[in-house]
Interface confidence: low
């Protein structure tokens, strides 16, 4: 799925109000600096792009992320606010539903959580020029292009 | 633990310009913006301006637009104001702060120590 | 800019009594900051978001509101409480208000 078409402010609205409370819910008892962050974004789209994929596909150790609360509300986000997601997620979401058995939070879980944290972080905030100052200057931003 | 160490006491005389330096420690540099906010002596808190150590993009107060500059190495994670063409009513303390963008409108969440300007002929 | 103006500027109270401290926007903005500082110290987060409290802040603090009215709130002084208060917004650029004095009357 091509997420540039999202509405980007509505999803962080998304994430500021629940998301973020949610995935922070889910890492409690965790120290922040228990894990390093190994997965990174360069702009919204991939953000987006690395994020559903940290949260719903199934992973080595962690196969147990997509009932949870921040997932459900990540699905609902990208649902409304990307034009023609749900359509691609039909199929997904019935092999997820056959995949799943127990909910188990193993430690791998908590390091992809961790990792998801900090894409949503990248994605909330990913430069300063997000903020529309007039007096925007960037030295070194060749590569990271922002869709609104 | 996240620290930010400032350099030591300047002073400087009117016309001068003035370079102060703010070292990260204890998290990721480039993950957050780093404001630059000043207080003159018995005054409220004043925004300079802020940059994103992960771009190098910057904003500034129009207050000092064309006066300062702010910088960042990220090899160091050390973070820099040069304020130019000094006057008397730049004395005052200024601090580095770190901005962190978990919560919802960037709060500013540790902050430097202080670096005292004195500017005097 | 948007301009934060903070009333009372000095607030005289004793140990003990509630604190309401008010932060009004010259325009609507989304969520304040409030921030604690002592003579000769950096300013330390209060509360973020305009109700969220920092780390290690006791819960006798509190903030609230929305728009262009806001209020932090000391539900009962203690010692350590007599500092200036100063609230800062995000919406555009930044912006820290005069600040209000909460001394010992």
């Known amino acids: 799925y091509d997420f540039t078409n999202c509405d980007f402010e509505k999803i962080k609205a998304a994430y500021l109000s629940t998301i973020s409370k949610d995935l922070i819910t889910y890492m409690s008892g965790t120290k922040s600096t228990e894990f390093n962050n190994t997965v990174s974004c360069s702009n919204r789209p991939h953000c987006l792009t690395e994020i559903q994929s940290l949260t719903f596909n199934p992973t080595a150790g962690c196969a147990s992320l997509a009932k949870e609360m921040f997932a459900m509300k990540t699905k609902a986000a990208l649902a409304i606010w990307c034009p023609g997601y749900s359509e691609t997620q039909i199929n997904a979401t019935q092999a997820m539903k056959k995949a799943r058995k127990s909910k188990v939070t193993t430690n791998k879980c908590l390091e992809q959580v961790s990792q998801l944290q900090g894409l949503w972080r990248r994605f909330n905030r990913p430069l300063l020029k997000q903020q529309g100052s007039s007096d925007y200057k960037d030295d070194d931003d060749k590569h990271h292009h922002h869709h609104h | 633990e996240v620290q930010l160490v400032q350099s030591g006491a300047e002073v400087k005389k009117p016309g001068a310009s003035v370079k102060v330096s703010c070292k990260a420690s204890?998290?990721?540099?480039?993950?957050?913006?780093m404001n630059w906010v000043r207080q003159a002596p018995g005054q409220r808190l004043e925004w300079m301006g802020i940059?994103?150590?992960?771009?190098?993009?910057?904003s500034y107060n129009q207050k000092f637009k064309g006066r300062v500059t702010i910088t960042r190495d990220t090899s160091a994670s050390t973070a820099y104001m040069e304020l130019s063409s000094l006057r008397s009513e730049d004395t005052a303390v200024y601090y580095c702060?770190?901005?962190?963008?978990?919560?919802?409108?960037?709060?500013?969440?540790?902050w430097g120590q202080g670096t005292t300007v004195t500017v005097s002929s | 800019e948007i301009v934060l103006t903070q009333s009372p500027a000095t607030l005289s109270l004793s140990p003990g009594e509630r604190a309401t401290l008010s932060c009004r926007a010259s325009?609507?903005?989304?969520?304040m900051h409030w921030y604690q500082q002592k003579p000769g110290q950096a300013p330390r987060p209060l509360i973020y978001?305009?109700?969220n409290l920092a780390s290690g802040i006791p819960a006798r603090f509190s903030g609230s509101g929305s728009g262009t009215d806001y209020t932090l709130t000391i539900s009962r002084l203690e010692p350590e409480d007599f500092a200036v208060y100063y609230c800062?917004?995000?919406?555009?650029?930044?912006?820290f208000g005069g600040g209000t004095k909460v001394e010992i009357k």
């Open positions: 702060a770190r901005e962190d963008y978990d919560y919802d409108g960037y709060a500013m969440d540790h």
């Open positions: 204890g998290y990721t540099f480039t993950d957050d913006y």
């Open positions: 940059i994103s150590p992960y771009n190098g993009g910057t």
């Open positions: 325009s609507s903005v989304s969520y």
């Open positions: 978001a305009t109700s």
């Open positions: 800062q917004q995000w919406s555009s650029n930044r912006t």
